[in-house]
């Protein structure tokens, strides 16, 4: 798929979305921490 999202199976799609959500939360937290430290 051109958008890089695995859609052959719903459960794999959901797992990938969960990982993306988790990474976004972690990276967002790190970014906020960096801004705070400045």
């Amino acid at each position: 798929h051109s958008d890089g999202i695995f859609t052959d199976s719903y459960s794999r799609y959901r797992k990938q979305m969960a990982v993306k959500k988790y990474l976004a939360a972690v990276l967002g937290k790190r970014y906020k921490q960096r801004v705070k430290n400045k």
Partner: antibody, heavy 121, light 111 residues
Framework: DVKLVESGGGLVKPGGSLKVSCAAS????????MSWVRQTPEKRLDWVAT????????WYPDSVKGRFTISRDNARNTLFLQMSSLRSEDTALYYC??????????????WGQGTSVTVSS | DIVLTQSPASLAVSLGQRATISCKAS??????????MTWYQQKPGQPPKLLIY???NLDSGIPARFSGSGSGTDFTLNIHPVEEEDAATYYC?????????FGGGTKLEIK
């Protein structure tokens, strides 16, 4: 209160088409993936289709692929199932169901009361 | 397709006793640490009701007398102590692999 109400079922001849709808209320419809599941007269449950919250992705079993199309209108909080080339084995009670929103995929936490589809000549 | 075989097809349990329902999959329904197994309860004239997701997680509002266990290919639904209102048909469902499939159901009667 979460509510799902199906409509549009009826009697259709083999080879015919039918579009059933599911009106959703009581939750942020566009945030939830949705499914159609049918129950045969013998009480067997069959998964029919699933669509993501935004409507970008859909999944079907081979038994209905190319004949059934799941879609949604998030502005109207409505889920659809367009059925064509209907066969006698498609006779069932058709339920719309909400996916539970957890990272655990495939569990359906709210179901409508169903709409009956009979395929017979 | 993954075939789910439920046993027994029906059982009668005395009030207050334990009901045990088995669901065996033709291949593993586990993926990346999760078991994609769900249990539903259905009473006559009603749609299925979610009881347990991810093999052992109780859905909100479901009494603690319901519990689910298992991984891989063998899963169990336990109800203890059984109450009158638990008379229903119970279905397992896997969503690890498309197509999602359901077991044939187990009818529970309360004695």
């Amino acid at each position: 209160d979460v509510k799902l109400v199906e409509s549009g079922g009826g009697l259709v001849k083999p080879g015919g088409s039918l579009k059933v709808s599911c009106a959703a209320s009581g939750f942020a419809f566009n945030n939830y993936d949705m499914s159609w599941v049918r129950q045969t007269p013998e009480k067997r449950l069959d998964w029919v289709a699933t669509i993501t919250g935004g409507g970008s992705y859909t999944w079907y079993p081979d038994s209905v692929k190319g004949r059934f199309t799941i879609s949604r209108d998030n502005a109207r909080n409505t889920l659809f199932l367009q059925m064509s080339s209907l066969r006698s084995e498609d006779t069932a009670l058709y339920y719309c169901a909400r996916l539970n929103g957890y990272d655990q995929a495939g569990a359906m936490d709210y179901w409508g009361q169903g709409t009956s589809v009979t395929v017979s000549s | 397709d993954i075939v789910l075989t439920q046993s027994p097809a029906s059982l009668a349990v005395s009030l207050g006793q334990r009901a045990t329902i088995s669901c065996k999959a033709s291949q593993s329904v586990d993926y990346d640490g999760d078991s994609y197994m769900t249990w539903y309860q259905q009473k006559p004239g009603q749609p299925p009701k979610l009881l347990i997701y991810a093999a052992s997680n109780l859905d909100s509002g479901i009494p603690a007398r319901f519990s689910g266990s298992g991984s891989g290919t063998d899963f169990t639904l336990n109800i203890h102590p059984v109450e009158e209102e638990d008379a229903a048909t119970y279905y397992c469902q896997q969503s690890n692999e498309d197509p999602w499939t359901f077991g044939g159901g187990t009818k529970l009667e309360i004695k």
